[in-house]
Interface confidence: medium
């Protein structure tokens, strides 16, 4: 089943238009903005989700130190170009012909240029560090309980294979979730860590992309875990290329 048959909706992406016009009257769902058919049994790619979002009406340290090459998405929202598989095209341009290269999660990895800018390949983001700060609680969460709950969440809600959750670090009130997935490790059908991280980010912000599943309610041994700040760092298989001006 690609979508819920009876009422013809997409459980994993509410930013779709669905109708029973697939083969044999099957429910088929298309992403808003791009009109591309989506597989509703798994996560929709971040590129298609961003495109849909732009088309929608406007409304002693154990913690990991992000590497000098880590990217943070400071550019915010843009209307991306996606390839036929729903992945980000390596080069993105805006309406004023300003262009830049992005990684597989759609984050800019070069200085901005003009239409002559070349982006030879889509560079894979193989390591994502999700840095969360939780609201004050009566006491610290038990690290192993927190670890188990976050791993379970990524497996159940985002369908990310447990092997891609490399580590969960905790130093109250900071939680860090490390996702790692090399090109060679990602098999057909595996959820991409970039897509899982994006769904998680939207869930944390109270903007769930799931249909009919309620918002994210994160608990550790029944105790609500409320996030007050999120930072996501992206590490690419090939370091980004920025001018010295950008780095200072």
């Amino acid at each position: 089943h690609t979508a819920a048959q009876d009422n013809c909706t997409c459980p994993t992406n509410k930013m779709t238009v669905c109708s029973p016009d697939g083969p044999g009257g099957r429910c088929q769902c298309r992403a808003l903005g791009s009109g591309m058919a989506v597989d509703c049994s798994t996560l929709t790619s971040k590129c298609l989700l961003l495109k849909a979002r732009m088309s929608a009406p406007k409304n002693a340290r154990t913690l990991v130190r992000p590497s000098e090459h880590a990217l943070v998405d400071n550019d915010g929202l843009y209307d991306p170009d996606c390839d036929p598989e729903g992945r980000f095209k390596a080069r993105q341009c805006n309406q004023t012909s300003v262009c830049w290269c992005v990684n597989s999660v759609g984050v800019r990895r070069t200085d901005k240029g003009d239409l002559s800018l070349r982006c030879d390949e889509l560079v894979r983001t193989h390591h994502i560090l999700i840095d969360l700060r939780h609201r004050p609680t009566a006491g610290a969460f038990n690290h192993s309980d927190l670890d188990a709950e976050l791993r379970r969440l990524f497996r159940e809600r985002y369908r990310l294979h447990p092997k891609f959750v490399a580590a969960v670090h905790y130093e109250q009130p900071t939680i860090q979730i490390e996702l790692r997935q090399n090109t060679s490790q990602k098999a057909a059908g595996d959820v991409d860590i970039g897509d899982a991280a994006y769904y998680f980010e939207r869930d944390i912000k109270g903007e769930s992309l799931f249909q009919g599943r309620g918002g994210l309610d994160l608990r550790v041994r029944g105790e609500p875990l409320q996030v007050e700040r999120t930072l996501i760092y992206y590490l690419d298989e090939i370091p980004p290329k920025f001018s010295m001006k950008r780095l200072t």
Epitope: A4, Q5, S41, R155, E156, R157, D203, F210, R213, G214
Partner: antibody, heavy 121, light 107 residues
């Protein structure tokens, strides 16, 4: 300890109304959603829907839209199920069950003891 | 709605036997399946959630596995107190749905 205590068994005539209560104790009432589940005699379990204890917003399964109403008395940590225009097929055991707001917690870890509603003329 | 097809509907086994119940979802529900035990005249009790996570205080003879559409619940060594009806439930998407139940009896 954490528990849900439901009101006593009810015997009603067809066309009448009934209101079943579910009183929570031992936890923060508004931290968890409250679900209602029906079990007809000798039958399985049917999810009727749930009520968001933070906002009071009810969600009903398709089959339970219309004559069934979920409500709250938050100050008393109590959820209610009201059934109007009772029919013979409403005769069942009704359970309340504690669940969460997100998909990860849509299973029920605490249940009321059940309230039997008998419809007989 | 997602249909949960549970089998068998009843079974009879001896004390100490390994008992297996299966549940098939009509569409992919990730690992969002719970298993409950219900004794006559009582409310159900959750044993397993998220396919394989044992709920607090549940004996380790109860286990669960599976993902996608196929799920299994196992009692590794049946005890007299395990006589009950067992239900699976998908907790992936609303409306939440239960399997038809499996009645477990002692031979």
């Amino acid at each position: 300890q954490i528990q849900l205590v439901q009101s006593g068994h009810e015997v009603k005539k067809p066309g009448a109304s009934v209101k079943v209560s579910c009183k929570a104790s031992g936890y923060t009432f508004t931290n968890y959603g409250m679900n209602w589940v029906r079990q007809a005699p000798g039958q399985g379990l049917e999810w009727m829907g749930w009520i968001n204890t933070k906002t009071g917003e009810p969600t009903y399964a398709e089959e339970f839209k219309g004559r069934f109403v979920f409500s709250l008395e938050t100050s008393a940590s109590t959820a209610y199920l009201q059934i109007s225009s009772l029919k013979a097929e409403d005769m069942a055991m009704y359970f309340c069950g504690r669940g969460g707001y997100g998909s990860s917690y849509w299973y029920f870890d605490v249940w009321g003891q059940g309230t039997t509603v008998t419809v007989s003329s | 709605d997602i249909q949960m097809t549970q089998s068998p509907s009843s079974l009879s086994a001896s004390v100490g036997d390994r008992v297996t119940i299966t549940c098939k979802a009509s569409q992919d529900v990730s690992i969002a399946v719970a298993w409950y035990q219900q004794k006559p005249g009582k409310a159900p009790k959750v044993l397993i959630y998220s396919a394989s996570y044992r709920y607090t205080g549940v004996p380790d003879r109860f286990s669960g596995s599976g993902s996608g559409t196929d799920f299994t619940f196992t009692i590794s060594s049946l005890q007299p107190e395990d006589i009950a009806v067992y239900y699976c439930q998908q907790h992936y998407i609303t409306p939440l749905t239960f399997g038809g139940g499996t009645k477990v009896e002692i031979k």
